[in-house]
């Protein structure tokens, strides 16, 4: 359905508030270093222009594509060359190359200061003084730090952010009301950003076939009562939505996401019995609710999977007629029967099944050949089951902090070339899998754990792509999306790594250590642990534990001292010398 003016079409569909919010997000995700005021100015100019097009779709420039309009606007920024360097060269290109160029310059790890949370009274005053600016600032700050954040979902976060301030700034104890809500939004926001980053990586690095396979598996688990044709329709629509958002087409993405929510709510009976409570909610909340909806119950009396996909003599005929449809149906049938499997495992099984059919359908006796597919599946299923069991036992034994430390050591030994901040960030997040998943019943552990690990490892891949330092990481990240986690799990100590020279400065600490929050103290200690392993990659667990225990004791002692700085200056070198001796 074509429109004379695309910008007018989207403005009318989305409404002014959402239109402005999405344009601000789009601009902030592209030009991550620009000041807030500059973005607000650009957004206001685009909005005023959109209004002229709504009034008269034939007005000058109203027929231009959104990429052309937005790109032209971004290229008016005066300091583009000074602030962004070679990104300014994008402006010499024509669409669609210009937009592709902007996309390639999105920075997953922008050099931006961490967001500092002001005092509650200061925030409440700012909220009351100018609510609109306060909320725009939130969108801007999140979007520029998370350039692939799912834009329509960010509008939902902003709505919750607004609601939290509206409620808590009137409460008797503002801080007690507000701070837990802000913590929750921050944690949920980081998780949402990381999940979306994996979707975009899947689409951009492995193509829409990979994303569609993921979506078939996940939606079949969620909607096991839905027919294959229904799941396929949802997958097609969902792929379009995420392709648009990952491609920077945020207005189209939000519009199509709203259409998808509308469709799902109008067709609940043929999708899932769990959608009812979502469909009564307002748009942003409804879309979020639908995305997070729990799995429906498995239908009674599902027929044998083996009958159609192994025992039937028509397997090769059906496969040859429409390979992707047949494999899609296999994945759908397998996934709807297995809510207890991770999506990544289901995709590995589908891949193994495909490889078996490719081999066997060319064999003398295809049926006898593909009957052996069962033997190939068992180790694929048991590997993540065993991994989850072992790591949950370790987590329960150690607790989160020490479990993170075990993973820090494990991953530093695997890929010691990776930067210390990246190893600390990724290992800390890998370690959070314990608290997130190990408390769940057995049937929910694997999907929780492995699919979460896929998200965290994607962060490692994305950061490593920006500054590649390890062939092993590149190999695990690029060879196969579904085998990333098993690839990293299989890595051993890097024997070729030349240990890092000892640098006393790395292990020099000061009194400021004592004023850090518990989390910041942990990060400091974990940074030292990574550096220790890089220096002595063959150090045993016992040796490392001894050093870390001494470190904790040394910090505790000096933080209790009257002259803390003097203590650090005196005890620090002793700790370093003792550590070197312990690791010799």
């Amino acid at each position: 359905d074509t429109h004379k003016s695309e910008v007018a079409h989207r403005f009318k569909d989305l409404g002014e508030e959402h239109f402005k919010g999405l344009v601000l997000v789009a601009f902030s995700q592209y030009l991550q270093q620009c000041p807030f005021e500059e973005h607000v100015k650009l957004v206001n100019e685009v909005t005023e222009f959109a209004k002229t097009c709504v009034a008269d779709e034939s007005a000058e420039n109203c027929d231009k594509s959104l990429h052309t309009l937005f790109g032209d606007k971004l290229c008016t920024v005066a300091t583009l060359r000074e602030t962004y360097g070679e990104m300014a060269d994008c402006c010499a290109k024509q669409e669609p190359e210009r937009n592709e160029c902007f996309l390639q310059h999105k920075d997953d790890n922008p050099n931006l200061p961490p967001l500092v949370r002001p005092e509650v009274d200061v925030m409440c005053t700012a909220f009351h003084d100018n609510e609109a600016t306060f909320l725009k600032k939130y969108l801007y700050e999140v979007a520029r730090r998370h350039p692939y954040f799912y834009a329509p979902e960010l509008l939902f976060f902003a709505a919750r952010y607004k609601a939290a301030f509206a409620e808590c700034c009137q409460a008797a104890d503002k801080a007690a009301c507000l701070l837990p809500k802000l913590d929750e939004l921050r944690d949920e926001g980081k998780a949402s950003s990381a999940k979306q980053r994996l979707k975009c990586a899947s689409l951009q690095k492995f193509g829409d076939r990979a994303f569609k396979a993921w979506a078939v598996a996940r939606l079949s688990q969620k909607f096991p009562k839905a027919e294959f044709a229904e799941v396929s329709k949802l997958v097609t629509d969902l792929t379009k939505v995420h392709t648009e958002c990952c491609h920077g087409d945020l207005l189209e993405c939000a519009d199509d996401r709203a259409d998808l929510a509308k469709y799902m709510c109008e067709n609940q009976d043929s999708i899932s019995s769990k959608l009812k409570e979502c469909c009564d909610k307002p748009l942003l909340e409804k879309s979020h609710c639908l995305a997070e909806v729990e799995n429906d119950e498995m239908p009674a009396d599902l027929p044998s999977l083996a009958a159609d996909y192994v025992e039937s003599k028509d397997v090769c005929k059906n496969y040859a007629e429409a390979k992707d449809v047949f494999l899609g149906m296999f994945l759908y049938e397998y996934a709807r029967r297995h809510p207890d499997y991770s999506v990544m495992l289901l995709l590995r099984l589908a891949k193994a099944y495909e490889a078996t059919l490719e081999k066997c359908c060319a064999a003398a006796d295809p049926h006898e050949c593909y009957a052996k597919v069962f033997d190939e599946f068992q180790p694929l299923v048991e590997e993540p089951q065993n991994l989850v069991k072992q790591n949950c036992e370790l987590f329960e034994q150690l607790g989160e902090y020490k479990f993170q430390n075990a993973l820090l050591v494990r991953y530093t030994k695997k890929v010691p070339q990776v930067s210390t901040p990246t190893l600390v960030e990724v290992s800390r997040n890998l370690g959070k899998v314990g608290a997130k998943c190990c408390k769940l019943p057995e049937a929910k552990r694997m999907p929780c754990a492995e699919d979460y690990l896929s998200v965290v490892l994607n962060r490692l891949c994305v950061l490593h792509e920006k500054t590649p330092v390890s062939e092993k990481v590149t190999k695990c990240c690029t060879e196969s999306l579904v085998n990333r986690r098993p690839c990293f799990s299989a890595l051993e100590l890097d024997e070729a790594y030349v240990p890092k020279a000892f640098n006393a400065e790395t292990f020099t600490f000061h009194a400021d250590m004592c004023t850090l929050s518990e989390k910041e103290k942990q990060v400091k200690k974990q940074t030292a642990l990574v550096e220790l392993v890089k220096h002595k990659p063959k150090a045993t667990k016992e040796q490392l534990k001894g050093v870390m225990d001494n470190f904790a004791a040394f910090v505790e002692k000096c933080c209790k001292a009257d002259d803390k700085e003097a203590c650090f200056a005196e005890e620090g070198p002793k700790f370093v010398a003792a550590s070197q001796a312990a690791l010799a």
């Epitope: 009396d301 599902l302 083996a306 192994v310 599946f377």
Partner: nanobody
Amino acid sequence: QVQLVESGGGLVQAGGSLRLSCAASGRTFSIYDMGWFRQAPGKEREFVAATNLRGVSTRYADSVKGRFTISGDNAKNTVSLQMNSLIPEDTAVYYCAAAVSNWLAKDPSAYSYWGQGTQVTVSS
């Protein structure tokens, strides 16, 4: 990793009934399907019935349809086979089997874990 123990076999007259039970222990969370196979002297092991412990799907060999009923209890990780209208051709060692996936397969290779077997003899 998963142990299966069968019980309930024995000698029965043609036309009689017997109930076989099988209890799984160990890493039972990894089990999805449980089934029964049988092997008569000098013959290959053959599929009898299977059930998906987490749903209510069942599957039977044509030779036992209407006479045998399989039922599973996910909470207790047990499976039972109620055998009615027994005939001498049902004489065999009956094996309980467990699979890590929901295939409801007839092929023994789909099943990762096996019991020791229990003898069922139907006399005429």
